[in-house]
């Protein structure tokens, strides 16, 4: 039997009020407001919180029973859709031990995981995996890619009690692995040996003069020489202009700098590697993965463009269940999503191509009607007259 | 790679008021937390405030609360710091730097560094 | 508000490893930066999160933070290593700067 710890799909219309708490940190934090969005597969079901506000801060969090993931698998899931075609903004939660204040939650507060997507800019299009382990928000070291389409997408990440972890977009897997190997929780395996420094005599030099090699005796040229083909001008003046120098020009004799033929050096050692030895600071740690208390899942987020929905969240301690959630609620609807979109997109598309077409009608009206106004009145013929008229003139 | 490149030495009466530039380049200036970090001579760095171009608010240490003002300004990529009732202990070289965000929230830039440093500015206050 | 605490100097010969301490409160807890300054130069980050290195800089340079102290390594100490060095923390939304520790490269 799955233990389901948080469950939040929005069903009950404004009852979510008095499930989730807005943080007063600050006074202008932005609001959440329940909607399905302008599209969706279902507009009752699909239903979430949605940011409303452009350019501001996020802070709303629920509370649930406090319960500890220790010797057992840990699932967060949820769904986020960015239907604003979003620039810059947070699509990520935070799960809270139950001693957070929620009333004071803000960009500090100290959370235990933090997990979901984030975009901004053209640099940032990432699915952020942090812990706090020992007081420290550890980052993983990997770059998971996040959705940055404007459809819904579901974000699930395990953390198993063997210290392995796994994130899912979609019920697809994008990620997996340790959580010793990806994230920089405990110090090094290995360090360099700080007793150990390359030997004096330690040659590095792959190649070296050859010492029976010498400079040529007609080496030694000037790099400049005074130009032999040029004449004095004739109307030169010693008195007046000084003595005449000739100008200088390239010697083409001239070799540069010579340098003795490189040999391979007899004494070379190749590249010194500095040897590496355990460190005595590291310590396996087998319960990285659990954490005492759980109580408090929170949207605590930056938004330029809001429109963002979250919805369907899940914390359980089951894969399975957590994935046939998943594909009864994002599963289920993400097909007639799409469809609905496209047909809005495409009616979007006739209606520009109308409005496209009566503005060119309108210019050619105008246009007609500026020729008119231009050309010289004449009196008034009919048709056939006009024509007898062009055909006599003929 | 984003670049900084500063304003020219500045030599101000006590009392007045200095405005240093920092332009970016190579580098998307919204993408990036920029501070400013001041050396005066022969001693170490210190942190006046800094400046999230994408989010428009500036923060500033305790110590220069009042005095300095940090702006930035997206259409020529550059920001700027201002400093206002100036003194001889204000002597100094001053750094614009800048962070990768690496994310939406306003603290991502904590976690990498600032890993571009301008060419520093010499401001000078002397009577 | 939040103090780091550096040793003025460092003296390391030539091909040795030289550890520069930054002492703090529960530093372990907060990420640590270090960054290399030469005589009439700009600051340049040589370590941040602790031990990441920024593409370019040697893999001799090393850093670990645990408990109350964080500690800059670098092994196989060349002249050109010497500089002053400034370990730098985030602390209530302000960053903080070490003294700095002068790092003398004997010889």
């Known amino acids: 039997e799955p233990a389901v710890y948080f469950k939040e799909q929005f069903l009950d219309g404004d009852g979510w009020t008095s499930r989730w708490i807005e943080s007063k940190h600050k006074s202008d934090f932005g609001k959440f407001v329940l909607s399905s969005g302008k599209f969706y597969g279902d507009e009752e079901k699909d239903k979430g919180l949605q940011t409303s506000q452009d350019a501001r801060f996020y802070a709303l969090s629920a509370s649930f029973e406090p319960f500890s993931n220790k010797g057992q698998t840990l699932v967060v899931q949820f769904t986020v859709k960015h239907e604003q075609n979003i620039d810059c903004g947070g699509g990520y939660v935070k799960l809270f031990p139950n001693s957070l204040d929620q009333t004071d939650m803000h960009g500090d507060s100290e959370y235990n995981i933090m997990f979901g997507p984030d975009i901004c800019g053209p640099g940032t299009k990432k699915v952020h995996v942090i812990f706090n382990y020992k007081g420290k928000n550890v980052l993983i070291n990997k770059d998971i890619r996040c959705k940055d389409d404007e459809f819904t997408h579901l974000y699930t990440l395990i953390v198993r009690p063997d210290n392995t972890y796994e994130v899912k977009i979609d019920n697809s897997q994008v990620e997996s692995g340790s959580l010793e190997d990806d994230w920089d929780f405990l110090p090094p395996k290995k360090i360099k040996d700080p007793d150990a420094s390359k030997p004096e005599d330690w040659d590095e030099r792959a190649k070296i003069d050859d010492p029976t090699d010498s400079k040529p005796e007609d080496w030694d040229k000037p790099e400049h020489i005074p130009d032999p083909d040029a004449k004095k001008p004739e109307d030169w003046d010693e008195e007046m202009d000084g003595e005449w120098e000739p100008p200088v020009i390239q010697n083409p004799e001239y070799k540069g700098e010579w340098k003795p033929r490189q040999i391979d050096n007899p004494d070379y050692k190749g590249t010194w590697i500095h040897p590496e030895i355990d460190n005595p600071e590291y310590s396996p740690d087998p319960s990285i993965y659990a954490y005492d208390n759980f109580g408090v899942l929170g949207l605590d987020l930056w938004q330029v463009k809001s429109g963002t929905i979250f919805d369907n969240f899940l914390i359980t301690n089951d894969e399975a269940y957590a994935e046939e959630f998943g594909n009864e609620t994002w599963g289920v609807t993400k097909a007639a999503e799409k469809q609905m979109k496209d047909k809005q997109d495409e009616e979007q598309r006739t209606r520009r191509m109308m409005r496209t077409k009566m503005r060119m009608r309108r210019m050619r009206r105008t246009r007609r009607k500026m020729r008119r106004k231009m050309s010289p009145a004449r009196p008034r013929t009919s048709c056939r007259e006009a024509c007898l008229q062009g055909w006599t003139e003929a | 790679q984003m670049q900084l490149v500063q304003s020219g030495a500045e030599v101000k009466k006590p009392g007045s008021s200095v405005k240093v530039s920092c332009k970016a380049s190579?580098?998307?200036?919204?993408?990036?937390?920029i501070s400013w970090v001041r050396q005066a001579p022969g001693q170490g760095l210190e942190w006046m405030g800094g400046i999230i171009p994408i989010f428009g608010t500036a923060n500033y240490a305790q110590k220069f609360q009042g005095r300095v003002t940090i702006t930035a300004d997206e259409s020529t990529s550059t920001a700027y710091m201002e400093l206002s009732s100036l003194r001889s202990e204000d002597t100094a070289v001053y750094y614009c730097a800048s962070s990768p965000l690496r994310g939406s929230g306003w603290y991502w830039h904590y976690y990498y560094g600032m890993d571009v440093w301008g060419q520093g500015t010499t401001v000078t206050v002397s009577s | 508000s939040y103090v780091l605490t550096q040793p003025p100097s460092v003296s390391v010969a030539p091909g040795k490893t030289a550890r520069i301490t930054c002492g703090g409160n529960?530093?372990?807890?907060?990420?640590v930066h270090w960054y290399q300054q030469k005589p009439g130069q700009s600051p340049v980050l040589v370590i941040y999160?602790?031990?990441k290195r920024p593409s370019g800089i040697p893999e001799r340079f090393s850093g670990s933070n645990s408990g109350n102290t964080a500690t800059l390594t670098i092994s196989g100490t060349q002249a050109m290593d010497e500089a002053d060095y400034y370990c730098?923390?985030?602390?209530?939304?302000?960053?903080?700067f070490g003294g700095g520790t002068k790092l003398t490269v004997l010889g």
């Open positions: 730098q923390v985030w602390d209530s939304s302000t960053e903080v």
């Open positions: 999160q602790d031990r």
């Open positions: 190579g580098g998307t200036f919204s993408s990036y937390a």
């Open positions: 529960n530093i372990g807890t907060k990420s």
